[in-house]
């Protein structure tokens, strides 16, 4: 499955949409910075078979979709941009699912690394907890937007390594 060719353009568009989503100056939000404990090791791609790496990317995109699909999110961001954002995420999820199906039976290792999936879920739980504690304030959402943009950039690096593996 030649994932990056079908996927990386959508990833880039997702980043561009997120960059446009800002509603307030981030300079006013410096004191709201937070350590979400991004699971860097899950995106290094060294310990994964290809199918497992794809499942981690899928989980991250699914969790991002869930995070930005809440009513609190809809109340914060521009509706048109959110719709574009959902479309790109949905496209990426479809690409990854198609890839995972192609990987079935190709590798001896399991399709999913359960520990890695749980680590990604806990990361998003920390983000949701932060938003709750900050009462979904505009600055809290700005910090989360910056964090998700960073995680998407880092996941793009994993995709690039997968492409070179082929």
């Amino acid at each position: 499955c030649d994932l990056p060719q079908t996927h990386s353009l959508s990833n880039r568009r997702t980043l561009m949409i997120m960059a446009q989503m800002g509603r307030i100056s981030p300079f006013s939000c410096l004191k709201d910075r937070h350590d979400f404990g991004f699971p860097q090791e899950e995106f290094d791609g060294n310990q994964f078979q290809k199918a497992q790496a794809i499942s981690v990317l899928h989980e991250m995109i699914q969790q991002t979709f869930n995070l930005f699909s809440t009513k609190d999110s809809s109340a914060t961001w521009d509706e048109t941009l959110l719709d574009k954002f959902y479309t790109e995420l949905y496209q990426q999820l479809n690409d990854l699912e198609a890839c995972m199906m192609q990987e079935v039976g190709v590798e001896d290792t399991p399709l999913m690394n359960v520990d890695s999936i749980l680590t990604v879920r806990k990361y998003f739980q920390r983000i949701t907890l932060y938003l709750t504690e900050k009462k979904y304030s505009p600055c809290a959402w700005e910090v989360v937007r910056a964090e998700i943009m960073r995680s998407f950039s880092l996941s793009a690096n994993l995709q690039e390594r997968l492409r070179r593996k082929e």
Partner: antibody, heavy 121, light 107 residues
Amino acid sequence: EVQLVQSGAEVKKPGESLKISCKGSGYSFTSYWIGWVRQMPGKGLEWMGIIDPSDSDTAYSPSFQGQVTISADKSISTAYLQWSSLKASDTAMYYCARHPGLNWAPDFDYWGQGTLVTVSS
Amino acid sequence: DIQMTQSPSSLSASVGDRVTITCRASQSIDGSLNWYQQKPGKAPKLLIYFASSLQSGVPSRFSGSGSGTDFTLTISSLQPEDFATYYCQQSYDFPLTFGQGTKVEIK
């Protein structure tokens, strides 16, 4: 390799204008803010202001607001610091440095080599 | 603006000495404090960020501690290359502000 490369030393007369540059490479230029720091001869570090190259949003120290203008051209991964009318007191070394924005990451982890600006009649 | 006050302004020490520099903020900045080292004619170099995180590539003899208003940079065993000026900087809110610097000289 991450690098911030600044333009060369400048010698100017009072009242003249000047624009110095800071070119970023080895990283996604729009993913980090660029800050400017002044160091007058034999003195400490003073933060002047910062720019988000993704949308050119800026913030200035009150001490430098209206005295300088910070800008960026993301198409060439370059940030700028400019003066419309230099004073002798602007004589200093000027550094640019990258900042992770709202991300939990090291602040000002990479610095330019500095641009020495000398203003003298 | 948040004022940052370093002490001492300068100190003399010998190779192998334990050196401590303090930095006090005029209001609470949580853990949003960075430490930089600067040598003559060179750009500052980040040593410690978020009060206690060691920047990649910085020797482990450097450590940082503190939160709120009081912070400390410690060099556990001073080396010849450590003679320089050290600055603290708050990254809690704009305008960002630096301490006035502490010059570490050879005794």
